[in-house]
C-alpha cells in the first residue's frame, strides 16, 4: 500500500506581500502525474480556483491581475493524480499593503545610537489601529507584531531594542493594521535608517540572553523581549 501523495509546494511571485493594484501569481507545484490543481482560500467556498497543469504537468499557475482586499488571506493547494487527491500544501499567506494610510516611524531618542545603549522605534498612525508591524529590510523573517490587548485601538506602538548591537543597524519600516484582517496592512511608513556606532564590532547576542535582536546579516527574525511601555500593546508572534 503506497503512502499518501506528497504535498505540493505553494508560493507567490513576486512575493506574498503585495501592494494594492499590483499583480501576483500563485504557483502550486506537485508531480508529473497531476491531472488538475486546486487552490483553496480559507473561509471561502472550496475550491477557490482550479487550473489544469502547465506542461510538463508538475505545476499550475493561478493569476491575480490586480491585488485587492478580496485576494488577501490564507491559501492552500492540492493536486489530483490518478490515485486521488494529494495532501494540502503548507499555507501561503497573501498580504495586501495599501489598505490604510501610512504610519510614521521614528527612533527615540535618535536613529543614531551607540552600541550597548538602548533605542526605541516608535510607529505612529493617524487613526487608531490595533496591530503594528515592524520590518527590517533584507531579513528572511522580518515581521514583528505588536497587537493590543482586548482589541483596544492605539495610535502608536513602541519597539524597544536593548542593548543595541551592530546587527540592529539597517533600514526599518512599519505597518499598521486592524485585527479583523491580519492580511490587510497600511501603506509602509517611510524608511528609517538605524545607524549603530561603536569602535568595536559587537558580538552577536546569543539566543538565550534576554535581549532584543534585530534581523541582521544572517536573517535572524526580530525577537522582542521586555515590556512595551505606554502602548497598551502586547507582543504577539504570528
Amino acid at each position: 500500500q503506497a503512502g499518501p501523495l506528497p504535498k505540493p509546494t505553494l508560493w507567490a511571485e513576486p512575493g506574498s506581500v503585495i501592494s494594492w493594484g499590483n499583480s501576483v501569481t500563485i504557483w502550486c507545484q506537485g508531480t508529473l502525474e497531476a491531472r488538475e490543481y486546486r487552490l483553496d482560500k480559507e473561509e471561502s467556498p472550496a475550491p477557490w480556483d482550479r487550473q489544469n497543469p502547465l506542461e510538463p504537468k508538475n505545476k499550475a499557475r493561478f493569476s491575480i491581475p490586480s491585488m485587492t482586499e478580496d485576494y488577501a488571506g490564507r491559501y492552500r493547494c492540492y493536486y489530483r493524480s490518478p490515485v486521488g487527491w494529494s495532501q494540502p500544501s503548507d499555507p501561503l499567506e497573501l498580504v495586501m499593503t495599501g489598505a490604510y494610510s501610512k504610519p510614521t516611524l521614528s527612533a527615540l531618542p535618535s536613529p543614531l545610537v551607540t552600541s550597548g545603549k538602548s533605542v526605541t522605534l516608535l510607529c505612529q498612525s493617524r487613526s487608531p489601529m490595533d496591530t503594528f508591524l515592524l520590518i527590517k529590510e533584507r531579513a528572511a523573517h522580518p515581521l514583528l507584531h505588536l497587537r493590543s490587548e482586548h482589541g483596544a485601538q492605539q495610535h502608536q506602538a513602541e519597539f524597544p531594542m536593548s542593548p543595541v548591537t551592530s546587527v540592529h543597524g539597517g533600514t526599518y519600516r512599519c505597518f499598521s493594521s486592524h485585527g479583523f484582517s491580519h492580511y490587510l496592512l497600511s501603506h509602509p511608513s517611510d524608511p528609517l535608517e538605524l545607524i549603530v556606532s561603536g569602535s568595536l564590532e559587537d558580538p552577536r547576542p546569543s539566543p538565550t540572553r534576554s535581549v532584543s535582536t534585530a534581523a541582521g546579516p544572517e536573517d535572524q527574525p526580530l525577537m522582542p523581549t521586555g515590556s512595551v511601555p505606554h502602548s497598551g500593546l502586547r507582543r504577539h508572534w504570528e
Partner: antibody, heavy 120, light 105 residues
Framework: EVQLQQSGAELVKPGASVKLSCKAS????????MHWVKQRPGQGLEWIGE????????NYNEKFKSKATLTVDKSSSTAYMQLSSLTSEDSAVYYC?????????????WGQGTTLTVSS | DIQMTQTPSSLSASLGGKVTITCKAS??????IAWYQHKPGKGPRLLIH???TLQPGIPSRFSGSGSGRDYSFSISNLEPEDIATYFC????????FGGGTKLEK
Amino acid sequence: EVQLQQSGAELVKPGASVKLSCKASGYTFTNYWMHWVKQRPGQGLEWIGEINPSNGRTNYNEKFKSKATLTVDKSSSTAYMQLSSLTSEDSAVYYCARGSLTTVVPFDYWGQGTTLTVSS
Amino acid sequence: DIQMTQTPSSLSASLGGKVTITCKASQDINNYIAWYQHKPGKGPRLLIHYTSTLQPGIPSRFSGSGSGRDYSFSISNLEPEDIATYFCLQYDILLTFGGGTKLEK
C-alpha cells in the same frame, strides 16, 4: 430541491451577441462552481467553461475562449453566458450545470437547456 | 485531448430486460468516468460517478464497472421511465463526453 432554471429559446441574427441566463435555487449559489455545456443537433456535448460564483474566477475550454464570457449576479443567484459574433455553428442547446462541491465529479445538477438558433 | 467512443449509438430495450452501454477512452482515465441519463426537454441526470458509485436516490438496477480505458454501464429490470439517452463523461484530464446512446422501446 436544487434547481437550475434557464432562460427561454433565442433566435438571433449572425454577427449578433446573446446572453443566456441560469437561475439557481435550493442551495447556496456561491458554494458551487457553475459550468456551461454545448450540444449541437445530432452531436455530442462539449464543455465550454466554468465560473466560481463566490469570486468570479473563470476557466474556459480553449475552443470557446473568444466566443463565451461567463459572469454571475450573486444577488439574484444567476449565472450568465454571453456568446458573441454568432454564426450558424453556434446554433445549439446550451446547458448550465452545477459543479460538485468535492470535484469528484464535475456536474451533479443541470438546467433544462436553452435552444439558440442563429439565422438570418 | 482524450476521446470517448460510446457504443452503441442506439439500442432497443425490452421491459424487464437488461441493456449494457460501453465507453472506450483513447487512454487510461483512471476510473474518472460518470454516467448520465438525458430525457428531452430536461437537464441530464447524474446516475453514477467514479465508475461505479451510485448517486443518492438512484435505483440499484443501474450499475457501472470498468478500468483503464474500458468502461460499461448497465440497466437491469428495465422500466418504462428508463427510455432516454445515456452518455458518459470522462473527467480524468479535462472533460470529454461520449456521443450518447439512445435507448428506445
